[in-house]
Interface confidence: low
């Protein structure tokens, strides 16, 4: 006869491990007992359990409540045991010694591998602002056994660096993703991908990039100078900019207060029917937590009663 077992049994932390030891014997052969022991190199054999054909199962005190026989019906030639709730300390070499009649004794070894799946964490770096140099966008850390693989999945251009810390029975891997912030990165996903044999599929943690910026301001509405004449209705100026965080807008008149009837609606300045009183220099002030921008325009309302031409100057300042 011969023993059938597995070279390696792999389980995930917390799962039950079936340690197989089956005697494939000739007709009429019987198994008297099967002794299970830890057989790690450099350590004395530590008994797990004894399966006896007559006396049943005896479990070593160190493994009380953790070793069982597989449920019935049981084959009398099957010396397999279940090790409940595998922990990292269970990883190692195991030996089954089978005493048979009349063929004598057989022994076999297997290695129990306990996978500890990682629980990855992603930590965003400092606030990203356009104009910064190479900056930490995020770091991702995962600890497991064996060491997990930590990579990044993103469309954003950047550089990665990894470091590993080995512990007695596991390893922690940290990967950092650095980039040069630009407004095009705003809203882009940056995904940490953790691979490990104890995971059914890769674990992914996604961080959405937020890059603070404020675009130059400009004013729209004065493109057709002939429209700005006395009596015209619906005239308006619109301040154009964009930013992250979204900016707020404020309108002022450089050469005095806003004329009565002029309405401020966020980025838009609405005029009542135009009069020459509406002529002047208007300033759009755009700001967010990152920066502020100004753009000013000169409005010259044309009075048809006068022959003088209308002039329009646009000035932008930061």
């Amino acid at each position: 006869g011969e023993l059938e077992t597995s070279d390696v049994v792999t389980v995930v932390l917390g799962q039950d491990a079936k340690l197989p030891c089956f005697y494939r014997g000739d007709s009429g052969e019987q198994v008297g007992q099967v002794a299970w022991a830890r057989a790690d190199a450099g350590e004395g054999a530590q008994e797990l359990a004894l399966l006896h054909s007559k006396y049943g199962l005896h479990v070593s005190p160190a493994y009380e409540g953790r070793v069982e026989q597989p449920p019935p019906p049981r084959n009398p030639l099957d010396g397999s045991v279940l090790l409940r709730n595998a922990v990292q300390a269970d990883e190692g070499e195991y030996e089954c010694r089978v005493s048979t009649f009349p063929a004598g004794s057989f022994q076999a070894r297997l290695r129990l591998r306990v996978l500890v799946p990682p629980l990855p964490s992603l930590n965003p770096g400092p606030a990203l602002e356009e104009g910064q140099g190479l900056t930490l966008a995020a770091s991702c850390t995962a600890e497991g056994s064996p060491a997990p693989s930590v990579t990044w999945d993103t469309e954003v251009k950047g550089t990665t660096s990894s470091r590993s810390f080995k512990h007695s029975r596991s390893a922690a891997v940290t990967s950092e993703f650095h980039l040069v912030p630009s407004r095009s990165m705003n809203g882009q996903p940056l995904t940490c991908v953790v691979s490990h044999p104890g995971l059914l599929q890769d674990q992914r943690i996604t961080h959405i990039l937020h890059v603070s910026f404020l675009a130059e301001a400009s004013v729209r509405g004065l493109e057709d100078q002939n429209l700005w004449h006395v009596g015209r209705e619906g005239a308006m100026l619109k301040c154009l900019s964009e930013g992250q965080p979204p900016p707020s807008y404020n309108w002022t008149r450089l050469d005095g207060p806003l004329p009565s009837g002029v309405r401020v609606d966020g980025d838009t300045l609405g005029f009542p029917p135009l009069t020459t009183e509406h002529s002047g220099i208007y300033v759009c002030h755009v700001s967010n937590e990152f920066s502020s921008r100004d753009s000013q325009v000169t409005v010259d309302v044309l009075d048809p009663q006068e022959d003088s031409g209308k002039q329009v100057d646009l000035v932008s300042a930061s």
Epitope: E4, T5, S6, V9, T10, D16, A17, K18, L19, P20, F22, P70, P71, P72, S80
Partner: antibody, heavy 123, light 107 residues
Framework: EVQLVESGGGLVQPGGSLRLSCAAS????????MSWVRQAPGKGLEWVSA????????YYADSVKGRFTISRDNSKNTLYLQMNSLRAEDTAVYYC????????????????WGQGTLVTVSS | DIQMTQSPSSLSASVGDRVTITCRAS??????LAWYQQKPGKAPKLLIY???SLQSGVPSRFSGSGSGTDFTLTISSLQPEDFATYYC?????????FGQGTKVEIK
């Protein structure tokens, strides 16, 4: 893409023989245990036989033991079921399915199945 | 052999209903239990393995629970494509055995 394609089914008289084949692709065939599962018309699923990745271990349902033989050719990525002494009650759609060895004789659930081949045993 | 008993054998439900199917093993099988969906003329499709793990590509409305001898398959909100027959299977011992099936029909 994992694919399992059965063939060889057909009409056969009671007492006759038939050999089913299952062509596998899209995975490392020799790394997986393979099974045959059948389904009689209007009935449930019944496991028939299984074979380890190397072909060294075979398993049979009591209802087919001694009549059916499972085998595999890992060089051809093909699983076989030789069916002899066929009976009317063997009439069914026969599916091949793959499963992964966890440890010793403990396998995963069958994650991929073929489309099936119909075997009709009738005189 | 381990006997797998499924209940009910059939049920009628409407789209959006919560559906529960149970499976009992004649002896403890740890979590070596799978749930399959089968539509007429098609091969079985693996939905749940290891009693409660969702097979890749299967909608999250399917879930499994239980260990030892009692198991449950739940469809949280029945969809039109879910009308089919569902089977449980133990693969703890050889021979692996199936439940007799539960047919989910449109009410």
């Amino acid at each position: 893409e994992v694919q399992l394609v059965e063939s060889g089914g057909g009409l056969v008289q009671p007492g006759g023989s038939l050999r089913l084949s299952c062509a596998a692709s899209g995975f490392t065939f020799s790394s997986y245990a393979m099974s045959w599962v059948r389904q009689a018309p209007g009935k449930g699923l019944e496991w028939v036989s299984a074979i380890s990745g190397s072909g060294g271990s075979t398993y049979y349902a009591d209802s087919v033991k001694g009549r059916f033989t499972i085998s595999r050719d890992n060089s051809k990525n093909t699983l076989y079921l030789q069916m002899n002494s066929l009976r009317a009650e063997d009439t069914a759609v026969y599916y091949c399915a793959r499963a992964e060895l966890l440890a010793f004789d403990v396998y995963t659930a069958s994650d991929y199945w073929g489309q099936g081949t119909l075997v009709t045993v009738s005189s | 052999d381990i006997q797998m008993t499924q209940s009910p054998s059939s049920l009628s439900a409407s789209v959006g209903d919560r559906v529960t199917i149970t499976c009992r093993a004649s002896q403890g099988i740890s979590s070596y239990l799978a749930w399959y969906q089968q539509k007429p003329g098609k091969a079985p499709k693996l939905l749940i393995y290891a009693a409660s793990s969702l097979q890749s590509g299967v909608p999250s409305r399917f879930s499994g629970s239980g260990s030892g001898t009692d198991f449950t398959l739940t469809i949280s909100s029945l969809q039109p494509e879910d009308f089919a027959t569902y089977y449980c299977q133990q693969h703890y011992t050889t021979p692996p055995t199936f439940g007799q099936g539960t047919k989910v029909e449109i009410k």
